[in-house]
Amino acid sequence: QRKRRNTIHEFKKSAKTTLIKIDPALKIKTKKVNTADQCANRCTRNKGLPFTCKAFVFDKARKQCLWFPFNSMSSGVKKEFGHEFDLYENKDYIRNCIIGKGRSYKGTVSITKSGIKCQPWSSMIPHEHSFLPSSYRGKDLQENYCRNPRGEEGGPWCFTSNPEVRYEVCDIPQCSEVECMTCNGESYRGLMDHTESGKICQRWDHQTPHRHKFLPERYPDKGFDDNYCRNPDGQPRPWCYTLDPHTRWEYCAIKTCADNTMNDTDVPLETTECIQGQGEGYRGTVNTIWNGIPCQRWDSQYPHEHDMTPENFKCKDLRENYCRNPDGSESPWCFTTDPNIRVGYCSQIPNCDMSHGQDCYRGNGKNYMGNLSQTRSGLTCSMWDKNMEDLHRHIFWEPDASKLNENYCRNPDDDAHGPWCYTGNPLIPWDYCPISRCEGDTTPTIVNLDHPVISCAKTKQLRVVNGIPTRTNIGWMVSLRYRNKHICGGSLIKESWVLTARQCFPSRDLKDYEAWLGIHDVHGRGDEKCKQVLNVSQLVYGPEGSDLVLMKLARPAVLDDFVSTIDLPNYGCTIPEKTSCSVYGWGYTGLINYDGLLRVAHLYIMGNEKCSQHHRGKVTLNESEICAGAEKIGSGPCEGDYGGPLVCEQHKMRMVLGVIVPGRGCAIPNRPGIFVRVAYYAKWIHKIILTYKVPQS
């Protein structure tokens, strides 16, 4: 008997997610089953279903399938979080590119290559034809979408709405053209799910037909989603295990992105005249080892055979026979032209002196014209002319191109926090440069701090789910967990982003952290139904001295009755003195039998000058700080509350106006609390959210 193919590989999985139909006309079919694989097989074959199955949900608790004629992109449908559900969507319906001839393409492109609108398949006007949906079951001849029901050479096509042009192919790109990677693809997180010979990839969470060690839960940072090609182990390019029992694994055909840049988070500083660190970024032209023996060309196998070729190490600049350090050795080296000496170090290259001279900027640095071209984390800046499209995306005026020369640090968008640059690193698209404000420069970056000139609230109203004030009131509160224990608070400001404090991250290993959302009890007791537990995929540190971090979640939070986002204030706004605000946290309460429930302390806004007086003049507040005093003596934020928000309401809208950071004592009587002023950093927050890629839900 022929073994039935396992079709679950044709679906994109979204864990802990279900689909709710808002449109009652949409149909659903359910049945008890044992595994998600069984649901997938039935969905793919449409067996016994009164509709074309586009997605299904597997209910793990009830062992039940829910098959849908729609997916998360359909109208009349919304996504919802649910611990016991896993959503699987047929990739053919969500893909916007074709594989091979595009026979399986089921996307929604409905315009031909020359721009003519397609004729619906069920219509005979203007062209009569025999391609009826009823004659081509399973080929999804829906609406007027481009299709290739017979698998013809040119790819998906349609009859056109122009009586003069009977049919034409549609311009849908090959998936292998759409997908691209940098370097050897270690940071590639695209959707290629078949190998270069066309074999379908095996799901990373499956052990058949090939058993392997790359379990998604063991390697949460490797992007082992569904059955997409990945490079977790430093191969020359992404690969996957295949569904062919006789081919364990194979490389995938993913082209190199046009602007090919290094993609490691620890990208070395590029130098040409000297060695910085171990010289991994050395790009000079020294081509002899320390004693003068010439180097062998990297692309040659004579006199020494090796695999350190330019093809295998794409981002290491293995040009000509120049000294390089592609493998993390202690300094640049090369193979030598002497058959008796395989390798030698180029230790004659001097070490760099890292001092940049006394570079500084005035105001916010919009007129800075220095020649520093390196970010604060040591990444080399990328050329401005390669990034103009991205720049236009987040500024609404024409930047002064005469200032944007080479790859020097600049401030074309009037950023309040100084010069910055693009990096060419997909994980860190841009960052600030390590330049300080000039000594004695007192130019304020925001004016009129203590006068309510700009309102903090945007004009929209506070949302209350179903008209009932539920715990949505605190749905944006996040418990940051460090090695399974609560360490700090945080605020969910966007589905994938949490605003918190820099000091909340003692370890550099992101696997040490988790974010808990939707909870009221710090231990999650009684919150099982509403709790969402998310891994952390990246930390974006705020401008120098801000003490802020934007923490990127590994997948977006699902907004529901228990999890919601909180608004940000307008940039540079001030909230009137005596405005009533609240701080929230699971921190130290002073009680011996603390119950672990989220606490709130009510504070009121105090002007910076008055605040300084309360601190007996020992503290001078600046434009990046906000002060709030307790209504009740001795109440206020403390250990465990750090990272959490100071929440204020204006025009019926709640927003996070401050972030609790260490350093100002613990709820000291008569000493108002000093918080990081979020309004001062609002533009930075928006810029990060706009420019950093987040995983799709």
Epitope: D266, G277, Q278, R483, P506, S507, R508, K511, G643, P662
Partner: antibody, heavy 115, light 110 residues
Framework: SLEESGGRLVTPGGSLTLTCTVS????????ISWVRQAPEKGLEWIAV?????ATDYASWAKGRFTISRTSTTVDLKMTSLTTEDTATYFC?????????????WGPGTLVTVSS | AYDMTQTPASVEVAVGGTVTIKCQVS??????LSWYQKKPGQRPKLLIY???TLASGVSSRFKGSGSGTEFTLTISGVECADAATYYC????????????FGGGTEVVVK
């Protein structure tokens, strides 16, 4: 500066609390760690208390050692002491607020566990 | 766990010579590694942090290199005052760690 105190002779099974007194160091900006060195042995990390109040311990120190702080001191409480715990105990300032390198050390205090 | 293995345990070197000490970590720590010098009866002294950055006031004869899992401390032009025990320490994470320090390398100057 940092200065350890509280080291003395203690009998096996006993308890002892060491204190690290800091001056000119802001505990809301720097983590503090305890490290020890037994006679003729290497440096051994014990525990750290971070700026946000969270703590970490070497796997062997969990349960028997407790690190805590006030605004100017960091204590290390040691229980069920054995002769293996005989060592010079150092407190050290950790660079910045989290786990990092130790850029300032105290002179050490000697703990002797013996019957 | 981030296990630290330091080699050799002891090394003898002549004045003016060069000594190389290796430190291997069981999993990658990027460049989050520090080196310390410890003399009997004295407190440890920070030499190098972030794998290759020289601490303030430390002679440039001390050089740190490496990243990932393999690191090296090189002392060139060795002087009598360099006789001490040298330790590496990982500054990446203390999740399930037995010891953040390597076992130490004793440098004996002849």
């Amino acid at each position: 500066s940092l200065e350890e105190s509280g080291g003395r002779l203690v009998t096996p099974g006993g308890s002892l609390t060491l204190t690290c007194t800091v001056s000119g160091i802001d505990l809301s900006s720097n983590a503090i760690s305890w490290v020890r060195q037994a006679p003729e042995k290497g440096l051994e990390w014990i525990a750290v208390i971070y700026v946000v109040g969270a703590t970490d311990y070497a796997s062997w120190a969990k349960g028997r050692f407790t690190i805590s702080r006030t605004s100017t001191t960091v204590d290390l409480k040691m229980t069920s002491l054995t002769t293996e715990d005989t060592a010079t105990y150092f407190c050290a300032r950790v660079y910045d607020s989290g786990w990092n390198h130790f850029n300032l050390w105290g002179p050490g205090t000697l703990v002797t566990v013996s019957s | 766990a981030y296990d630290m293995t330091q080699t050799p345990a002891s090394v003898e070197v002549a004045v003016g010579g060069t000594v190389t000490i290796k430190c291997q970590v069981s999993q990658s720590i990027s460049s989050w590694l520090s080196w310390y010098q410890k003399k009997p009866g004295q407190r440890p002294k920070l030499l190098i942090y972030r794998a290759s950055t020289l601490a303030s006031g430390v002679s440039s004869r001390f050089k740190g290199s490496g990243s990932g899992t393999e690191f090296t401390l090189t002392i060139s032009g060795v002087e009598c005052a360099d006789a001490a025990t040298y330790y590496c320490q990982q500054a990446y994470s203390v999740s399930n760690v037995d010891n953040a320090f390597g076992g130490g390398t004793e440098v004996v100057v002849k």
